[in-house]
Interface confidence: medium
Amino acid sequence: YSHWPSCCPSKGYPSEELLRWSTVPVPPLKPASLDFHSVSCRASEDGPLNSRAISPWRYELDRDLNRLPQDLYHARCLCPHCVSLQTGSHMDPRGNSELLYHNQTVFYRRPCHGKKGNHKGYCLERRLYRVSLACVCVRPRVMG
Amino acid sequence: YSHWPSCCPSKGYPSEELLRWSTVPVPPLKPASLDFHSVSCRASEDGPLNSRAISPWRYELDRDLNRLPQDLYHARCLCPHCVSLQTGSHMDPRGNSELLYHNQTVFYRRPCHGKKGNHKGYCLERRLYRVSLACVCVRPRVMG
């Protein structure tokens, strides 16, 4: 693996703008009629994947202007169990709706200081940030 | 939203190492007994989420040493349909196993040039990169 140095801007270097980019699925623009998926346990026959899933979920915005990406979305399961494929509404207790997590690489900006300690712009500090991506219908874990 | 300047290292600035971090779920260390989940359609009663899912998937490594993160993992569905919650093995054609995609923010390193055009280290160029996160059991889309 290669090692990369961190970086700080200094006068005279290019300063193209780094605009905000979300890195987990931005909930698609959707008709307000789909709002009810956020309160009831059902799997739709249309709409985005998170509405058609038998482990449906909604997205919750997490915004931090000192972080790149500034907007992250966390999945929140709408049902404890999976929705029946047959009806699209009744729960099937044989399946659990579980969150899938991942550790997202994010960058926080913090002041950079030059040799004399004077402020020289911003440095990016890399961190892992736990994000829930989706809800997945799983068979319950059987303990051996 | 705030706008952030891009950054390039220059002499005299901190150069802490930016080490490789994977940003989608690194397949957990698992007994190789779970290898077989990758060849037949079944939902396990133990193991990681991607094995217990009724839309099981495996992870495929995508490595690029000139990208941050250097390692990304793409989900690959193991089944066209969802596995029956009852048996954990038979397919239920009423459900489709569909990939959930997102546009991952990644950074590519490229040479930075100073005022006089001389090489001054690396700049990070931000891009969107499409990654599949998981497979989700969904009700087939009904066309109106």
């Epitope: - | 007994s33 077989f36 990758s38 093995s89």
Partner: antibody
């Protein structure tokens, strides 16, 4: 009844390649994996690897991984195993087997076998 | 690789006898063990999977037991058609490995 029907016997010279086919019927091909196993004359069974018919995922035994390729064709529900740079010790009966979908891995149906003879 | 050792390597028994074949793994494989029967010139046939589950269509006189490293295949009442080689297989870790086989002959 599930059936796996393999191609006929082959005689090859050292350094050549062989491609054995395995035609599956009477089950949903994409839901199962196919494994390949060989048996040298008078010897035991040796696992060569497997492939997911839907996922295309392959896992090969280290002993042959540089010389073997497994593929599937969903349109004809056929699995293939190609072994390159044949040596005399590759002489064996090659079997394809379906990987079952229970909570563990097992080979629930087998092809009849294909004898591959490597001789100069 | 996990080594699978079967014993005995061969046995001869009479019709109606109770026959026991053992298989030992070189490391713990939990219950990831299958048993196959192979007759001369034929492909193996699955008898038992996951150490003790009887494959559909296999006679009830066949049974399997064990976990960890030691496993047993039992034929409660040997029948004339039960001759052949019995082979164990571990599926805990790749490469999957097979035992050397136990040849069962009818007296």
């Amino acid at each position: 009844q599930v059936q796996l029907v393999q191609s006929g016997a082959e005689v090859k010279k050292p350094g050549a390649s062989v491609k054995v086919s395995c035609k599956a019927s009477e089950y949903t091909f994409s839901n199962y994996g196919i494994s390949w196993v060989r048996q040298a004359p008078g010897q035991g069974l040796e696992w060569l690897g497997w492939i997911g018919a839907y996922s295309g995922f392959t896992k090969y035994a280290q002993k042959v991984q540089d010389r073997i390729t497994m593929t599937t064709d969903a349109s004809t529900t056929t699995a293939y195993m190609e072994l390159r740079n044949l040596r005399s010790d590759d002489t064996a009966v090659y079997y394809c087997a379906r990987v079952g979908t229970g909570t563990d891995s097992y080979f629930d149906f087998w092809g009849q076998g294909t004898l591959v003879t490597v001789s100069s | 690789d996990i080594q699978m050792t079967q014993s005995p390597s061969s046995l001869s028994a009479s019709v109606g006898d109770r026959v026991t074949i053992t298989c030992r793994a070189s490391q713990n494989i939990n219950s990831h063990l299958n048993w196959y029967q192979q007759k001369p010139g034929k492909a193996p046939k699955l008898l038992i999977y996951t150490a003790s589950s009887l494959q559909s269509g296999v006679p009830l006189r066949f049974s399997g037991s064990g976990s960890g490293t030691d496993f047993t295949l039992t034929i409660s009442s040997l029948q004339p058609e039960d001759f052949g080689i019995y082979i164990c297989q571990q599926t805990y870790i790749t490469p999957l490995t097979f035992g050397g086989g136990t040849k069962v002959e009818i007296k």
